[in-house]
Interface confidence: low
């Protein structure tokens, strides 16, 4: 029959070549003069010239080893046709089956791997994977199947069986107990793959695993007792630095001690940090401490981690004494500021108010003041009595040193202490309005038309305060109201001018007299500047030139 | 990026020998085959061997057997090659090459920047 | 050993214009035939391998053809930075051979 069983070759054949296979054979060769030829890939196209055939014979030729890494089998075609170059066959399958020799070594795909296990965990757990590739065939053979085994680790502690691997996956896992980071923080494993299943060539790998911390190790006071001296009053002062020491991986949240103060500071007066570098407790006073009160304060601080602890650990707790040193302290006014009320103008001598302060200490100091900032130079201050004066006249209206009717000063108390000691208050005197300022008209300067004027409204200012204001009341004088008019708006806020009689172009100047509501009376000249011109205008138009 | 970066010049006496290496980096060293290549002054390219720094395995063409000894380091990964013997004949441009994959079938794709040895008394 | 005889050994071309390089081996290397550039002072460049594949970021108008032992190396639209000396490259079978080389220069 004109058939060919599928045909199997080993690689890396030593020839010779070319290499007789099989033989094509068609029976129709009893008829005619048979030529054979073969097609297809390893043929007559890419890799060509692998395989030949005899033309005439039909014996099928190797011509060079085969590489079954390269090409792991070839479908070729079996052409018979007669002397007339007529097909005598339909085209013939011919498979040839590249067979595997182990002619690889497995290799590892890193020279180092790298893994990690946290100490302490139980036997059975995974660690990493490693992989070797084997060109070889793995299906049909062994050649490519590659086991997996642990040649050596280092160190051997605490024995040199604290791994295993599993032949066929390379998987890494714990097979002892006992991974103590802090005693073996890595371990370096060599690994071999060999293929034929462990039979064959071998080639190794480092496999590296890491050691991971966990938190195992309590942090401890070392010392455990502190004695420690702090001025009063001191707030944010450090009042002792807490040295811990753990075993576990500095910088690690297992390291990183955390403080908490658990009895002593019923005040709630101090605080305490870690400080990022050291991982000391910083003790500092979160308000003043009193010496007066309480001169001795008893702290107890315990110590854990950022991580909470993997098996039950006792916690560490140190003592801190506190001794609060006595400081002189400054003179208080009572109240540190003081609002008093006041009346503008009052005569120069006359007392304006008492302001004294206290001292905390407890010894009787003496106290003496003076004024610290009296910006306009108004008061004077009794050094032992804390009486304020006035020695200047108070202005409400003084725009410069009043600020919404309130004059500001600042007090100073010192006492006699060594070395002594100054506290400030503040006086804030609210000055009384008195009607000493008379109202006046804004703007003071107008400019009108001497034929049909438009009337010029006056905006009336007061500096002083209702009921030192308007209503106000309008008056002309020394003969202005013979060619003009005041008159007050309804709301006593304006006053209406208005030209009531021809004047020729030119600048006068009228008499305004305004009063408030409390008749204080201001006289005002406005400045009238009258144009040759109808209605309303804002400059006076120059003299006009025909032609 | 993958990088393979070559020593300095060397200038060598006549029956000495010298060491130039190679360093790669940003691909697995160990598990690519590195080639050696002899350039002599306006000449062509020949090929001297290579090395599989997995395992050590080499290759050399015939021509250059005793007189080139290629090793690699893969804690460093730095191949070495080794000339002996050195004569003016050897006074050439050398070149390490990454092959580009596995076996033998495959081309050349990363250069070192070359090295250049003179023989000189 | 295997003999390879690469043609031209010079060409002066004009940039724009296509040139084509050949390289004859004296045995069948199938597809296994790569084409390196080597510039005036620098390392040789890989440009096509397998006969066809172009080198990662190599522009396509290089392209490679050919098998067994007659392979071409076609240049189209030739470039500035294309000027060079070209080598054609056995990597079927030990030793790796190179051809001679062609050297591109700027007409």
């Known amino acids: 029959d004109w058939v060919v069983a599928p045909i199997s070759v080993p690689e890396n054949g030593k020839g010779p070549f070319p290499q007789r296979l099989n033989q094509l054979k068609s029976n129709k060769d009893r008829d005619t003069k048979i030529f054979y030829s073969i097609t297809g890939p390893g043929a007559d196209s890419p890799p060509e010239g692998v395989f030949a055939v005899e033309k005439e014979t039909g014996w099928l030729l190797l011509n060079k080893p085969l590489d079954r890494e390269e090409i792991a089998k070839y479908e070729l075609f079996g052409h018979a046709v007669s002397e007339n170059g007529a097909s005598v066959e339909d085209p013939m399958n011919i498979s040839i089956i590249v067979t595997d020799q182990n002619d690889h070594k497995p290799k590892f795909t890193q020279d180092t791997f790298r893994g990690s296990v946290l100490e302490g965990v139980m036997p059975g757990t995974s660690v990493m994977q490693v992989t070797a590739t084997d060109e070889d065939d793995a299906v049909n053979t062994y050649n490519g199947v590659v086991a997996y085994s642990i040649h050596s680790q280092e160190p051997k502690e605490p024995h040199d069986l604290m791994f295993t691997i599993h032949k066929s996956t390379g998987t890494i896992s714990v097979i002892s107990s006992g991974l103590d980071r802090e005693k073996v923080p890595e371990y370096r494993l060599t690994v071999q793959a060999t293929d034929m299943d462990g039979e064959g060539s071998t080639t190794t790998a480092e496999a590296v695993v890491q050691i991971l911390d966990a938190n195992d190790n309590a942090p401890e006071f070392d010392p455990q007792k502190y004695e420690a001296h702090v001025p009063e009053n001191a707030v944010g002062h450090e009042v002792q630095r807490l040295t811990v020491t753990d075993l576990d991986a500095p910088n690690s949240p297992a390291w990183r001690a955390t403080y908490l103060i658990m009895g002593g500071d019923d005040g709630d007066h101090f605080t305490i940090t870690t400080h990022p570098e050291s991982n000391q407790g910083i003790l500092t006073t979160r308000k003043g401490l009193d010496f007066e009160a309480k001169n001795q304060h008893t702290l107890y601080v315990e110590v854990t981690n950022e991580a909470p602890f993997v098996l039950k650990l006792p916690t560490s707790t140190a003592t801190i004494v506190v001794h609060v040193e006595d400081v002189n302290e400054a003179p208080v006014f009572v109240p540190p500021s003081k609002v008093v009320e006041v009346q503008e103008g009052i005569p120069t001598g006359e007392p304006v108010c008492v302001y004294t302060a206290e001292d905390p200490d407890k010894e009787n100091q003496k106290i003496s003041y003076r004024i610290l900032r009296d910006p306009a130079g108004w008061l004077a201050m009794d050094p032992d009595s804390g009486q304020v004066t006035a020695v200047g006249t108070l202005d409400r209206e003084d725009e410069q040193f009043v600020r919404n009717n309130i004059y500001e000063v600042m007090v100073l108390a010192m006492d006699n202490g060594s070395p002594p000691t100054t506290g400030t208050g503040t006086l804030l005197l609210t000055l009384i309005d008195v009607n000493d300022h008379g109202p006046v008209p804004e703007p003071r300067q107008i400019t009108i038309c001497n034929q049909s004027p438009v009337r010029q409204v006056l905006n009336i200012t007061d500096k002083d305060l209702s009921p030192h204001t308007s209503p106000f009341q309008a008056q002309l004088t020394d003969d202005s109201d013979i060619y003009w008019t005041a008159e007050v708006n309804e709301e006593g806020d304006t006053v209406v001018l208005s030209l009531k009689k021809f004047l020729k172009q030119d600048t006068y100047d009228v008499h305004l007299s305004l009063s408030d509501h409390g008749n204080k009376e201001q006289l005002t000249v406005i400045r009238a500047t009258v144009c040759d011109c109808h209605g309303h205008v804002e400059t006076c138009p120059g003299p006009w030139k025909g032609g | 990026v993958q990088l393979v970066e070559q020593s300095g010049a060397e200038l060598v006496k006549p029956g000495a020998s010298v060491k130039i290496s190679c360093k790669a980096s940003?691909?697995?060293?160990?598990?690519?085959?590195m080639n050696w290549v002899k350039q002599r002054p306006g000449k062509g390219l020949e090929w001297i061997g290579r090395?599989?720094?997995?395992?050590?395995?080499?290759k050399y063409n015939g021509k250059f057997k005793g007189k080139a000894t290629l090793t690699a380091d893969k804690s460093s990964s730095t191949a070495y090659m080794q000339l002996s013997t050195l004569t003016s004949e050897d006074s050439a441009v050398y070149f390490c090459?990454?092959?580009?994959?596995?076996?033998?079938?495959?081309?050349?794709?990363?250069w070192g920047q070359g090295t250049s040895v003179t023989v000189s008394s | 050993e295997l003999q390879m005889t690469q043609s031209p050994a010079s060409l002066s071309a004009s940039v724009g214009e296509t040139v084509t390089i050949t390289c004859r081996l004296s045995?069948?290397?199938?597809?296994?035939l790569a084409w390196y550039r080597q510039k005036e002072g620098e390392s040789p460049q890989l440009l096509v391998y397998?006969?066809?594949t172009l080198a990662e970021g190599v522009p396509s108008r290089f392209s490679g053809s050919g098998s067994g032992t007659q392979f071409s190396l076609k240049i189209n639209s030739l470039q500035p930075e294309d000027f060079g000396n070209y080598y054609c490259?056995?990597?079927?079978?030990?030793?790796?051979?190179f051809g001679a080389g062609t050297k591109l220069e700027i007409k």
């Open positions: 090395i599989y720094p997995g395992d050590g395995e080499t």
């Open positions: 045995e069948n290397i199938y597809s296994y």
């Open positions: 940003g691909y697995a060293f160990s598990s690519s085959w």
């Open positions: 397998n006969s066809k």
């Open positions: 490259q056995n990597h079927y079978g030990f030793p790796f051979t």
């Open positions: 090459a990454r092959q580009r994959d596995y076996g033998a079938l495959y081309a050349m794709d990363y």
